[in-house]
């Protein structure tokens, strides 16, 4: 082992370096001193450090560590924050378009039901937005609300047009009759199933992304313990006390120190890995009735089919309701069975197949691929931080916390440390309370994600069978399937090609006419490709 270089006889170098950390020189000895009061940089001989300097070094070391940690997580944090914002905005756009498609369907096919239908549709989609953002709304209640509100208007405007105003007090009876007589058939149940499944998954996806941000924010702003501060000081600054200004810590030594300092943080690793893999499973399952884009953008068709179902049974219904609500309505009924102009042109329900466009679905998969590159983020943190702070190459001629060594030996370093504080003890303390809390939250979201990520062979078609629809309505060979009445089915691939234009809005007044009902025109549409660059909250 080489003899230590002669200490700086005047502590001049140490003084000039320390002045950069702390203006004023009152704490720096002019010449080396015994340093008997030092607690971290325990001297083997005269030293250029004082107790006050040591305290300042500790503070600086902990600040450095926090900055290193923040820069280590910056890319990951940006990735999740950006995507959480993009997806939330994209989901809001889907809801807005779904509302406008539905309003356009009413305007084009049932003008007599507007503006009341617009009001009910608006309230329904407001509830959808609230639900996605985490409000405690029951989806079945939302759907029941929509049909409860629509039926009195359908009955009084379509089935019994010309009902006198005095008869409008039958609305309450009609609301009750709607459920009792199942006037919309199984369509409300079908919509409940589709909407609840797709929104549940969407909501949990957003919750998971927001928790990801919380995890990074928590570990980003960790305050390191005093013990850690002492270890970091010894690694980064104690060499200065001996006048060794240019010496770098040994790489192996840095790893040992970082593992000690980050023992609590590294405990997140297991749950973080599970989080990314569970999120991947969820995303892989977000298709068909588990894809809100697919479900919501096709709701207008299912609602249209449900109204057609009412109209097909108008004669029978009018008679039954006439008896049921007779006390509310003293008049002769005439059945308005299906006026010609109420038929929707079946051509408008055939939406063109769109291949290879980037959509929400591909955007989700892209996010997962990027997240997977960070799957070892927490276990790799100690190594990452050492590789991004000054350490000696190949562990030669480096600082081991006590002296300059030709070659770093972990065992020697550990023995040297034992007298001052126990590295093992530091590891055994367990994670900080905030880390424990975030681990609990990760466990919870992982549980939720696992619950939602059912096996690939989801019981989708079985569910539809139970609701009384033929299994042919939604076969596995179909790309996407919305609606239940064959004629009114829309097959749509990758609907959201317009999401790059986050401000794009299809007003009801600008809604396409019957010839291409509620289907965005290709030339109005730009791809979703640059969405990541549009609304970056960190720019």
């Amino acid at each position: 082992q080489p003899p230590p270089p002669p200490p700086d006889a005047t502590c001049h170098q140490v003084r000039s370096f320390f002045q950069r950390l702390q203006p004023g020189l009152k704490w720096v000895p002019e010449t080396p001193v015994p340093g008997s009061d030092l607690q971290v940089c325990l001297p083997k001989g005269p030293t250029c450090c004082s107790r006050k300097m040591e305290e300042k070094y500790q503070l600086t070391a902990r600040l450095n560590m926090e900055q290193l940690l923040q820069s280590a997580s910056m890319e990951l944090k940006f990735l999740i924050i950006q995507n959480a914002a993009v997806f939330q905005e994209a989901f809001e756009i889907v809801v807005r378009h779904a509302k406008n498609y539905t309003n356009a369907m009413f305007k084009n096919n049932y003008p007599s039901l507007t503006p009341q239908a617009f009001e009910f549709v608006g309230e329904f989609f407001t509830d959808v937005s609230l639900y996605i953002l985490g409000s405690d709304i029951n989806v079945d209640d939302m759907v029941n609300e929509l049909f409860d509100s629509l039926f009195p208007v359908i009955y009084t405007q379509l089935m019994n047009p010309g009902l006198p105003d005095s008869a409008l007090d039958i609305n309450e009876c009609l609301r009750g009759a709607r459920r009792d007589l199942k006037v919309f058939g199984n369509f409300p149940k079908l919509i409940m199933t589709q909407v609840s499944k797709s929104l549940q998954v969407t909501r949990i996806f957003l919750q998971a992304l927001n928790l990801g941000i919380e995890v990074i924010n928590t570990t980003d702003h960790l305050k390191f313990s005093k013990d850690c501060g002492r270890m970091l000081t010894r690694m980064w600054y104690c060499s200065y006390c001996q006048g060794l200004m240019m010496v770098k810590p040994c790489g192996g030594y840095c790893n040992v120190v970082m593992q000690g300092c980050m023992a609590g943080v590294v405990e997140i690793d297991k749950y973080w890995r599970e989080y990314i893999l569970s999120l991947e499973e969820l995303v892989n399952g977000m298709y068909r009735i588990y894809d809100m884009e697919n479900v919501l953008l096709g709701l207008f068709s299912t609602i249209h089919d449900s109204i057609q179902y009412v109209q097909k049974n108008a004669g029978k219904l009018t008679t039954t309701i006439g008896k049921l609500c007779a006390h509310s309505q003293q008049r002769q009924y005439r059945s308005a069975y299906y006026p010609e102009d109420l038929f929707i042109d079946k051509k408008v329900l055939k939406v063109a197949h769109v291949e290879h466009e980037e959509t929400l679905s591909s955007r989700r998969r892209e996010l997962i691929q990027k997240l997977k590159s960070f799957i070892s983020f927490y276990s790799a943190l100690p190594g990452y931080i050492c590789s991004h702070s000054p350490v000696a190459e190949n562990d030669t001629l480096c600082w081991n916390g006590q002296e300059l060594v030709e070659r770093y030996s972990q065992k020697a370093a550990r023995n040297g440390m034992k007298n001052q504080f126990n590295l093992h003890e530091l590891k055994m303390k367990g994670p900080e309370p905030v880390v424990s809390q975030i681990i609990d939250k990760l466990k919870h979201i992982n549980q939720l994600l696992r619950t939602m990520s059912m096996p690939k062979g989801r019981v989708l078609d079985k569910n539809l069978d139970e609701e009384g629809f033929e299994s042919g309505d939604c076969g596995d060979d179909e790309d996407e399937c919305i609606g239940g009445s064959g004629d009114g089915m829309i097959k749509v691939k990758n609907q959201l090609r317009f999401l790059a234009e986050l401000a794009y809005d299809l007003d009801v007044d600008d809604a396409p006419g019957n010839s291409q009902q509620a289907t965005p025109k290709d030339n109005e549409i730009s791809t979703f490709h640059n969405l990541g660059n549009v609304h970056s909250p960190l720019k």
Epitope: D127, S129, D141, N144
Partner: antibody, heavy 121, light 110 residues
């Protein structure tokens, strides 16, 4: 004629319990969310609790959470508020109100006349 | 949950207009949520005047109108009449679907 009629109010000692009822008529009870709103003497309106039409979702103000329980019996067209661990600050006229909607709180289009609850020793 | 902010009082002469403001936060008035307005006479139950920010139930005179912008809503009464002297409350709900009322505004017809 849409009507709501509250009952069950009265004088009660602090720490005791009381159950309010609200009988509904003239509308399809199960289709609408229902609420309890209170008004302390000389003060403004304070929302207490709500329940969705199906009874599947319930909501409470922070001031009563854990002490009050809202419930409904759709077969009897009746809304209830079970009030436990009553405090002096719970003294108020309690109104039962019907929501315009079934899924959650929106606007209260029909109100009862209110029942006075006095909590005092 | 904290109450929405309303001015405690407002006044006007018959035939004049009065506007009552109601300020909330991004999680109640400013969100997707709707604002409603109620009129209450002393010793009586409140009556719904406006729902869904700007809709009037049948039977409410068109002198009453509501609007919402950002985190604020307002109720305008035009052509003030003696019977408009009452307390007025705004109401919305927060992101947890819990209802919030304003503190109330006493309107005096001079």
């Amino acid at each position: 004629q849409v009507q709501l009629q509250e009952s069950g109010g009265g004088l009660v000692q602090p720490g005791r319990s009381l159950r309010l009822s609200c009988a509904a008529s003239g509308f399809t009870f199960s289709s609408y969310a229902m609420h309890w709103v209170r008004q302390a003497p000389g003060k403004g309106l304070e929302w207490v609790s709500a329940i969705s039409g199906s009874g599947g979702s319930t909501y409470y103000a922070d001031s009563v959470k854990g002490r009050f329980t809202i419930s409904r019996d759709n077969s009897k067209n009746t809304l209830y508020l079970q009030m436990n661990s009553l405090r002096a600050e719970d003294t108020a006229v309690y109104y039962c109100a019907k929501d315009r909607r079934g899924s959650h709180a929106d606007a209260f289009d029909v109100w009862g006349q209110g029942t006075l609850v006095t909590v005092s020793s | 949950q904290s109450a929405l902010t309303q001015p405690p009082s407002a006044s006007g002469s018959p035939g004049q207009s009065v506007t009552i403001s109601c300020t909330g936060t991004s999680s109640d008035v400013g969100g997707y949520n709707y604002v409603s307005w109620y009129q209450q006479y002393p010793g009586k139950a409140p009556k719904l005047l406006i729902y869904g920010n700007s809709n009037r139930p049948s039977g409410v005179p068109d002198r009453f109108s509501g609007s919402k912008s950002g985190t604020s809503a307002s109720l305008a009464i035009t052509g003030l009449q003696a019977e408009d002297g009452a307390d007025y409350y705004c109401q919305s709900y927060d992101s947890s679907l819990r209802v919030v009322f304003g503190g109330g505004t006493k309107v005096t017809v001079l």
